[in-house]
Interface confidence: medium
């Protein structure tokens, strides 16, 4: 742990580690019964993670603020960094125990050591994120999270260089979601699909999360998304609380980040 150059270090907030990854239903959070969670993992060539596998992943930085099914009907979630809104201020596996009612609805924690790894935590001042396999088409059943963590006081300017995801009403099939926060729970900015380049986005703080998800059928060309650091000195006049100036989307300052 600790700060270095104003950045909180350690590979926290990974969404996939040691073959363990978090899955939620396409309909959203906490929608999977035990049988459905098991089926989701198996469909992708994996299985429900054991408590030990989840703890091993947590030890190398796997942190998700969502309870999910594990093997043998257990429910819990891994916390690396304690926070007031997640994990009751504790670290470790927040364990709900083995559930008697297997029809309860939670997310899922899957284990698949052969799953394609993508995403991660990035502290560089600039970088380009690409969909897995770009410039080739991405695969079905992908889920990737890119977490950007810059120095306190800096902002993130996100721009879309290439963008071609499957078209589906409301982007229910394949999509990229952007969050103006450190996770995929708070600060939702938008969900994007299709082949139009979304407008640039400038964060309100020093963190941002990008999530890419593809479903089980039909793929497309993929994307390249670039971010650069906006230093406090060059923030220009961002008094405009909302909306769009040119092709840049300035986000209202609703979220404070450490």
């Amino acid at each position: 742990w600790g700060f270095k150059n104003g950045i909180f270090h350690n590979s926290i907030w990974l969404e996939q580690a040691a073959g363990v990854y978090h899955r939620e239903a396409r309909a959203g959070r906490y929608k999977l019964t035990y049988a459905e969670a098991k089926a989701v993992c198996e469909f992708e060539g994996g299985r429900l993670a054991t408590y030990k596998q989840l703890e091993a992943a947590r030890k190398i930085g796997f942190h998700v603020c969502a309870a999910g099914w594990m093997a043998k009907g257990r429910v819990g979630y891994p916390i690396v960094k304690p926070g007031p809104n997640c994990g009751f201020g504790k670290t470790g596996i927040i364990d709900y125990g083995i559930r008697l009612n297997r029809s309860e609805r939670w997310d899922a924690y899957c284990y698949n050591p052969h799953a394609k790894e993508c995403g991660g935590v990035f502290t560089d001042p600039k970088r380009i994120f690409k969909s897995p396999g770009f410039p080739n088409e991405y695969d079905d059943n992908q889920v990737c999270y890119w977490h950007i963590r810059l120095k306190y006081g800096q902002r993130i300017h996100l721009s879309f260089l290439d963008f071609d995801l499957e078209h589906d009403p409301g982007c229910l099939a394949d999509y990229v979601e952007i969050y103006d926060s450190y996770d995929d729970v708070h600060g939702f900015v938008g969900r994007y699909c299709g082949d139009e380049l979304p407008e640039d986005i400038i964060s309100t703080g020093n963190v941002m999360t990008l999530k890419f998800l593809s479903d089980a059928s039909v793929t497309a060309g993929g994307f390249q998304i670039k971010y650069v650091t906006v230093d406090p000195a060059s923030k220009s006049s961002q008094a405009k609380n909302t909306s769009t100036t040119g092709n840049k989307k300035f986000l209202p300052g609703r979220f404070s980040h450490l």
Epitope: P169, G170, G194, E196, S217
Partner: antibody
Framework: EVKLVESGGGLVQPGGSLSLSCAAS????????MSWVRQPPGKALEWLGF??????????EYSASVKGRFTISRDNSQSILYLQMNALRAEDSATYYC???????????????WGTGTTVTVSS | QIVLTQSPAIMSASPGEKVTMTCSAS?????MHWYQQKSGTSPKRWIY???KLASGVPARFSGSGSGTSYSLTISSMEAEDAATYYC?????????FGSGTELEIK
């Protein structure tokens, strides 16, 4: 001419079931997402769900108000769209329209062709 | 879900008069679509992608707006324009319709 014609409406008791059909003609049915929309008497339109086209395996999505009670399916050999309605309630009384979903670039989906509608009344 | 509020609920206009109706979204949406429905008939696509007229729609109709505020305008009201107009979004799920603006001819 592109045409959608619904049938199967009528009077049904609360808790009962009904199946609506929508016969499509004038276009390649398998190439399109198809949807159901309803309109209670004197009220606004409400989207119920849609079913995807062949490339997406004909998977369906539903609105929260009907999920678990209504099922959308399609017979592609006959170009017919179905809406199976179970556990019907008084508030399900409405004119039911099938509509073709048209896509012309992200994120622009809209209902470009509408059927004539069929009326469902749920009452004891 | 995004709630679309149309105003006014009912309005009347004389032939030749300019008419504007609005559709306000509870959250920002990318585009708005509009449908025309005459009494006892099914809706018809009317304006899509905020401002594009569907085929067969007279040029006196126009659409505009962005974010949470959209409008449909008729530059010169004609008797055949009397109908109910519904706005609709699909920027986020589920797709939603407005409550409608009923336009009468004076």
């Amino acid at each position: 001419e592109v045409k959608l014609v619904e049938s199967g409406g009528g009077l049904v008791q609360p808790g009962g079931s009904l199946s609506l059909s929508c016969a499509a003609s004038g276009f390649t049915f398998t190439d399109y997402y198809m949807s159901w929309v309803r309109q209670p008497p004197g009220k606004a339109l409400e989207w119920l769900g849609f079913i995807r086209h062949k490339a997406k395996g004909y998977t369906a999505e539903y609105s929260a108000s009907v999920k678990g009670r209504f099922t959308i399916s399609r017979d592609n050999s006959q170009s017919i769209l179905y809406l199976q309605m179970n556990a019907l309630r008084a508030e399900d009384s409405a004119t039911y329209y099938c509509a073709r979903l048209y896509y012309y670039g992200s994120p622009h989906w809209y209902f470009d062709v509408w059927g004539t509608g069929t009326t469902v009344t749920v009452s004891s | 879900q995004i709630v679309l509020t149309q105003s006014p609920a009912i309005m009347s206009a004389s032939p030749g008069e300019k008419v504007t109706m609005t559709c306000s979204a509870s959250s920002s949406v990318s585009y708005m679509h509009w449908y025309q429905q005459k009494s006892g008939t099914s809706p018809k696509r009317w304006i899509y992608d905020t401002s594009k007229l569907a085929s067969g729609v007279p040029a006196r109709f126009s659409g505009s707006g962005s974010g949470t505020s959209y409008s449909l305008t008729i530059s010169s009201m004609e008797a055949e324009d009397a109908a109910t107009y519904y706005c609709q979004q699909w920027s986020s799920n589920p797709p939603t319709f407005g409550s409608g603006t009923e336009l009468e001819i004076k």
